[in-house]
Amino acid sequence: MMTGTIETTGNISAEKGGSIILQCHLSSTTAQVTQVNWEQQDQLLAICNADLGWHISPSFKDRVAPGPGLGLTLQSLTVNDTGEYFCIYHTYPDGTYTGRIFLEVLESSVAEHGARFQIP
């Protein structure tokens, strides 16, 4: 039975040209995290393997940085970066947990972070 929940940074916004940290946290389970995949809608951004470390997709090598922790830092943001991001936790023995973050990249200088929320 999957008992864990993923807490994410929720709905967030950031300025064009700036950076943002995407964070997820798996709680309420003793399952071992073997790997975390970060996806942007249709694209695989990065992989963090518990034993082997990080790999960034060649498509995003220049704009994505690993961390902090199991999170992901997006740099040089453009309006096209607006959309859904998913952290996919591969765990043993539970299986897969997925968290969702919605990022809005704003042209203006007003960019406020949204509240945290949980996805079971």
Epitope: D42, L44, I47, H55, P58
Partner: antibody, heavy 119, light 107 residues
């Protein structure tokens, strides 16, 4: 059992077009990123195209950019490679391959289909 | 583009002996390197990913090492089925590139 079966290869004249297909089975096709790789006779491997799970993004090397188009039909579990303005140097065995779900490497390959560009 | 240079082009080894294959990248690729085995008339088979991780079902006699620009594939004790061509590949940046291959033949 994972299977990738390429088809559509053959003899084509320089400047001509060809469409390759890769029928996938034994796994949930829409959950995987896919590649086309080619190998000229007696030569090494060359990456040709990459497509994301839903088909929204594609990537190519300069050698085929603007001439080749990778696409997919997830409802039909099929990957395609449309090849236009073919040149003699495009002669090769073309393989479709599946990206692993834990890395950016290719864990399953088809047996390939031969494309010969010659007049 | 990142050039992957493999050496030697051909390696003659007796069954039971150790084989060491080299792959050098023209720039730092971290650990974004894979090794594939290809036998005549067959498609390539993934052996090693992440420079040192063995793919599922790959025998323990195959091991990979290295990071940055220098990588090694070692076959600890060659079996008859290991005689083939081996390719390294980098997936650090586009275009994805392969080495020219090392043919491991029976001595």
């Amino acid at each position: 059992e994972v299977q990738l079966v390429e088809s559509g290869g053959g003899l084509v004249q320089p400047g001509g077009s060809l469409r390759l297909s890769c029928a996938a089975s034994g796994f949930t096709f829409s959950d995987y990123y896919m590649y086309w790789i080619r190998q000229a006779p007696g030569k090494g491997l060359e990456w040709v195209a990459y497509i994301t799970k839903g088909g929204g993004s594609t990537y190519y090397p300069d050698s085929v950019k603007g001439r080749f188009t990778i696409s997919r039909d997830n409802a039909k579990n099929t990957l395609y490679l449309q090849m236009n303005s073919l040149r003699a140097e495009d002669t090769a065995v073309y393989y479709c391959a599946r990206q692993t779900n834990y890395d950016f490497t290719m864990d399953y390959w088809g047996q390939g289909t031969l494309v010969t560009v010659s007049s | 583009e990142i050039v992957m240079t493999q050496s030697p082009a051909t390696l003659s080894v007796s069954p039971g002996e150790r084989a060491t294959l080299s792959c050098k990248a023209s720039q730092d690729v971290g650990t974004s390197v894979a090794w594939y085995q290809q036998k005549p008339g067959q498609a390539p088979r993934l052996l090693i990913y992440w420079a040192s991780a063995r793919h599922t079902g790959v025998p323990a006699r195959f091991s990979g090492s290295g990071s940055g620009t220098e990588f090694t594939l070692t076959i600890s004790s060659l079996q008859s089925e290991d005689f083939a061509v081996y390719y390294c590949q980098q997936y650090s940046s586009y275009p994805l590139t392969f080495g020219g291959g090392t043919k491991v033949e029976i001595k």
